[in-house]
């Protein structure tokens, strides 16, 4: 069971100084992480017993393990159901606390109910202020039943319950008809899923036998022990003020565990801590009484005394609940109470006993859950003691229960009950996951869920590449580690398992499903550098590189051409696909800007170094087109051009440029200045006869504008080959600038 | 579903007896306060008796007290009222009711109120 | 014993109209203890309203109760046809139920 205690403190005088706290043994209980599960919760529960809403009450969290309930102003704020949740996923368990007013007009005889399936419970409510009107019974807040005022039996109204089954569990409340419901007398019904001494799925397994009050848990068959007792069986009494399932809390104050409500996970439910008893548990036992609630009877033999918190202490020769056995009766000695082994291993497990006589090999026998008895198979005898070791054959799960060590001399008898556990070691459920990958390198959280049982002590990965026999490479990480795979090999799949480890001989776990994981290319080395760019208009950029020599093939698959705009904060990338390129045509740039550029090689995913940065500026951009752009043949070598100039011009024109192309022509355009802006005419001369030519022109500002229409015209026939074409403008027939 | 299901009227001469039953199905009737009520014709409702859960528990209107006795069979889920000494002004429809108890609105007391009642049978008292 | 008074003995209405019927209790009541029942012709008894003001399971929101002490109300916001009815209010005191006149 949950190691899980909710204690309510009913020093009542002040409702302001009432508090619950709930305590937790369980490791790293109440940090919330994932490690370690969610933190406990503590809060009053409405659902079944309404109250007048207050204030908020005030949750403060002592350390991991303890959480404190406080600011009850009035005592109607504490009367009702409190609970307290911890423990981590399948053992996430509710401590339930049920407080009545001890002013209430009906009080139960007995707030916590525990019984076994198909038994008759019986809740008493005693009459505390008596009203003459029904007494109506709930169940979970829910109509159950009504009594007439006259079937008061010795000032008790009795429910009786026949032949209960675990939905009949809950709470229970017993209110006069004409009075406000909080001054009901509520109660906890707890009803276990089996018979009494039974336990498991079909309440086929046998209860250990729990002593001093403690509850077979009908799920696992576990001792669930009042507060102040430990052991599988509740056998062991703790130290005065002190509760936990291993005796490690303190009960808080100088007065000890004095009125303290200690409530435990069910089929427990909730009594005074050992020592005490009564409605507020500050009463201490009557003599010849003892543990929780007084519950439990001395009745010591030759000559022990009755401690209220551990019952018999017994003087020197007598052992035993009410030294009713001689030290001369063979005694099991520090047997522990719980060993834990893994599935099909086959352990060792030691029996120590002493006595008069002395207890020899074949005296001390080790009885399985299933009734089958192993013989020692060596012994070790000393003065003191005779240790019996058994080899226990291979575990199955069946093996998981309640085992005893029993020791037969001419002396007598003794046995010995301990709780074996079989865990099963875990196997992942799920492949380890790649986080990142490298071209060397594998980063891998291998943390899965996993079938079986933890905790986890380590954890292996094994990987090797795809479809290769070698030996599996093996890694042993933490648990709470990403791993780091090293020294691989570039662009390799690689096949990875991992293997799940707990605790103790033979906990290696099978190892879970295999993934694959692909490293990266090898990253690029290569650093190139620019040769030269040139400005091909206001937008336009033609970009050339080399990269060093290097012997073998080139590692890459193309380059990428990186333009900052620091201005405006804005990149523009540009992919060159072949490791070949050595020169990138950049369009649609923005005219007017001072671009950084670089340019790295790319293999993959993964980028080479970035050659050092240049830094361009493209010119602004130009002028509108020349309008109404005309040709008209001259000659057989001459064409003349006419147009109008620019409109609504942002400054004066610098020049205009003129391309001439022969229509279906292959070879590249030539373009021919104008430098004196004023003139609408120029000739081409040099050109060849009986051709057909296209021609365009733009003006120049400080940056190029836009290209004319085009306009197509044809030289007259019968010439020479010329030698090229040449312009002449209008105002200067000398000084050609060809 | 809860039903109730009253039968055994008729007419009977003043100073006769009559038994008059009340069968439940739907609802765990031995849990349950059971009542009779009855209506002269033209008139409005009177209670006439209670009876508890257990059975050994009853109430009588004073009008009724000493004549009619209220008893249950919970394994038969069957209500009963016999009637003696009949009078004239018995004449009435008889129903039986069950009593059931809720929360009522803000934190008060329980509140009781009449959830199922049967159809009636009508016992006549003449001569 | 507590007597209980309605007013008035008969209230002649149309549907769509807002109903108001009056309950009067002798001495004080709890108004835990205050509950409203409709009867129509040929029919036995329905409980419409609980501990003075709940309505009870299947009871549309157009009825509503209020009052405490000696005074209660049951109001019907807006009648519908099936509303035309003899309507009862009922007490509880001393494991005995009273009702009204209707």
């Known amino acids: 069971a949950v190691d899980l205690t909710l204690l309510a403190n009913l020093r009542l005088t002040d409702p302001q100084r009432f508090f619950l706290t709930c305590v937790s043994g369980e490791a790293g209980a109440g940090r919330g992480s994932d490690a370690w599960g969610p933190p406990l919760l503590l809060e009053k529960d409405d659902r079944i017993v309404r109250t007048p809403p207050g204030p908020p009450l005030r949750l403060a969290r002592n350390g991991s393990h303890q959480v404190t309930l406080r600011g009850f102003s009035k005592p109607s704020d504490l009367v009702g159901v409190f609970s307290c949740v911890g423990g981590a996923g399948a053992r996430r368990t509710r401590v339930i606390y049920v407080h009545n007013s001890p002013g209430a007009h009906l009080l139960p005889d007995k707030v916590t109910h525990t019984v076994n399936k198909g038994d008759t419970a019986v809740l008493s409510a005693r009459v505390h202020k008596e009203k003459q009107t029904d007494v109506i019974w709930k169940s979970n807040g829910s109509y159950f039943y009504t009594l007439d005022w006259h079937e008061a039996q010795d000032g008790r109204f009795l429910l009786q319950l026949p032949n209960v089954q675990p939905p009949s569990s809950g709470i229970y409340s017993a209110t006069y008809l004409e009075a406000s419901p909080l001054g009901s007398a509520f109660f906890r019904l707890i009803v276990r899923g089996c018979g009494a001494g039974r336990w498991g799925p079909g309440c086929t397994k046998e209860c250990p036998g729990c002593l001093h009050g403690g509850v077979c848990h009908d799920h696992d068959g576990e001792c669930v022990c009042p507060p102040g007792f430990t052991g599988t069986r509740c056998e062991q009494a703790c130290r005065e003020g002190r509760f936990g399932q291993s005796c490690q809390e303190q009960c808080p104050g100088i007065s000890g565990c004095r009125g303290l409500t200690f409530c435990l996970p069910d089929p427990y439910g909730c009594s005074c801590g050992s020592g005490w008893r009564g409605s507020q548990c500050q009463e201490a036992c009557a003599p010849g009484h003892f543990g929780a609630d007084c519950r439990l009877q001395c009745q010591c033999q030759n000559g022990g005394t009755c401690d209220r918190f551990s019952g018999c202490v017994c003087p020197s020769g007598w052992h035993g609940v009410h030294c009713e056995k001689s030290d001369r009766i063979p005694q099991i000695l520090n047997m522990a109470s719980e060993l834990e082994f893994n599935l099909e291993t086959m352990p060792r497990i030691n029996c120590a006993a002493a006595g008069n006589p002395f207890p020899v090999r074949g005296s001390i026998e080790l009885r399985k859950p299933d009734g089958t008895v192993l013989l020692s198979t060596k012994a070790i005898v000393e003065p003191e003691k005779t240790t019996a070791e058994f080899e226990v054959p291979r575990l199955v799960l069946a093996d998981s229960g309640f085992w005893e060590c029993r020791v037969s001399t001419s002396g007598g008898q003794d046995s010995r009950r301990f709780k074996v556990n079989v865990k099963v070691p875990p196997v992942p459920l799920a492949a380890p996951r790649l986080l990142t990958k490298q071209s060397r390198q594998l980063v891998v959280s291998p943390l899965v869920s996993f079938s079986g049982d933890g905790p986890i002590s380590t954890v292996r990965l094994h990987y090797r590449p795809q479809d290769s026999t070698m030996d599996w490479s093996t890694i042993v990480v933490d648990p709470s580690e990403n791993v780091t795979l090293m020294n691989l090999r570039p662009k390799t799949g690689y096949s990875v398992r991992v293997q799940l480890s707990r605790p103790g001989e033979g906990g290696e776990g099978a190892w879970g499903p295999p993934t694959l994981m692909t490293t990266d290319c090898p990253e690029p080395l290569l650093q190139p550098w620019l040769e030269g760019w040139h400005v091909e208009g206001t937008d336009r950029l033609r970009v050339s590189w080399s990269l060093p020599l290097v012997p073998g093939p080139l590692v890459g698959d193309g380059f990428l051409l990186r333009l900052w705009d620091g201005t405006r904060g804005q990149e523009r990338r540009e992919n060159v696909s072949s490791p070949q390129a050595r020169t990138a045509l950049l369009t649609g740039l923005t005219p007017g800007t001072h671009y950084q550029l670089d340019v790295q090689l790319y293999h993959c995913t993964l980028l080479g170094p970035a050659s050092p940065p240049a830094h361009v500026l493209l010119p602004p951009s130009g002028p509108p087109a020349p309008r109404h752009l005309h040709a008209q043949a001259l000659s057989d070598s001459e064409i003349q051009l006419t147009w109008k100039h620019p409109e609504a011009l942002p400054g004066p024109i610098s020049k205009y440029v003129v391309e001439v192309q022969v229509a279906g022509g292959a070879g590249d355009p030539l373009w021919i200045d104008v430098d004196r802006p004023e003139e609408t005419s120029t000739i081409i001369r040099g050109l060849n006869a009986s051709t057909r030519y296209l021609f365009r022109m733009r003006a120049s500002i400080q940056g190029l504008g836009d290209w004319s229409n085009t306009v197509e015209e044809s030289t007259l026939g019968n010439g020479l080959q010329a030698e090229g074409p040449v312009q002449e403008s209008r105002a200067a027939e000398e000084g050609l600038d060809q | 579903e809860v039903q109730l299901l009253e039968s055994g009227g008729g007419l009977v001469q003043p100073g006769g007896s009559l038994r008059l039953s009340c069968a439940a199905s739907g609802f765990t009737f031995s849990m349950y306060v059971m009542k009779w009520v009855r209506q002269a014709p033209g008139k409005g409702l009177e209670w006439v008796s209670s009876i508890y859960p257990s059975g050994g528990y009853t109430r009588y209107a004073d009008s009724v007290k000493g004549r009619f006795t209220i008893s249950r069979d919970n394994s038969k889920n069957t209500l009963y009222l016999q009637m003696n000494s009949l009078r004239a002004e018995d004449t009435a429809v008889y129903y039986c009711a069950r009593v059931n108890y809720y929360d009522s609105s803000g934190y008060g007391p329980i509140a009781p109120g009449l959830d199922y009642w049967g159809q009636g049978t009508l016992v006549t008292v003449s001569s | 014993d507590i007597q209980m008074t309605q007013s008035p003995g008969t209230l002649s209405l149309s549907p769509g109209e807002r109903a108001t019927l009056s309950c009067r209790a002798s001495?004080?009541?709890?108004?835990?203890?205050l509950a409203w029942y409709q009867q129509k012709p040929g029919q036995a008894p329905r409980l419409l309203i609980y501990?003075?003001?709940s309505r009870a399971t299947g009871i549309p929101d157009r009825f509503s109760g209020s009052g405490s002490g000696t005074d209660f109300t049951l109001t019907i916001s807006r009648l519908e046809p099936e509303d035309f009815a003899v309507y009862y209010c009922?007490?509880?005191?001393?494991?005995?139920?009273?009702f009204g006149p209707g």
């Open positions: 009922q007490q509880y005191g001393s494991s005995l139920f009273t």
């Open positions: 001495q004080s009541v709890s108004s835990s203890y």
């Open positions: 501990g003075a003001s």
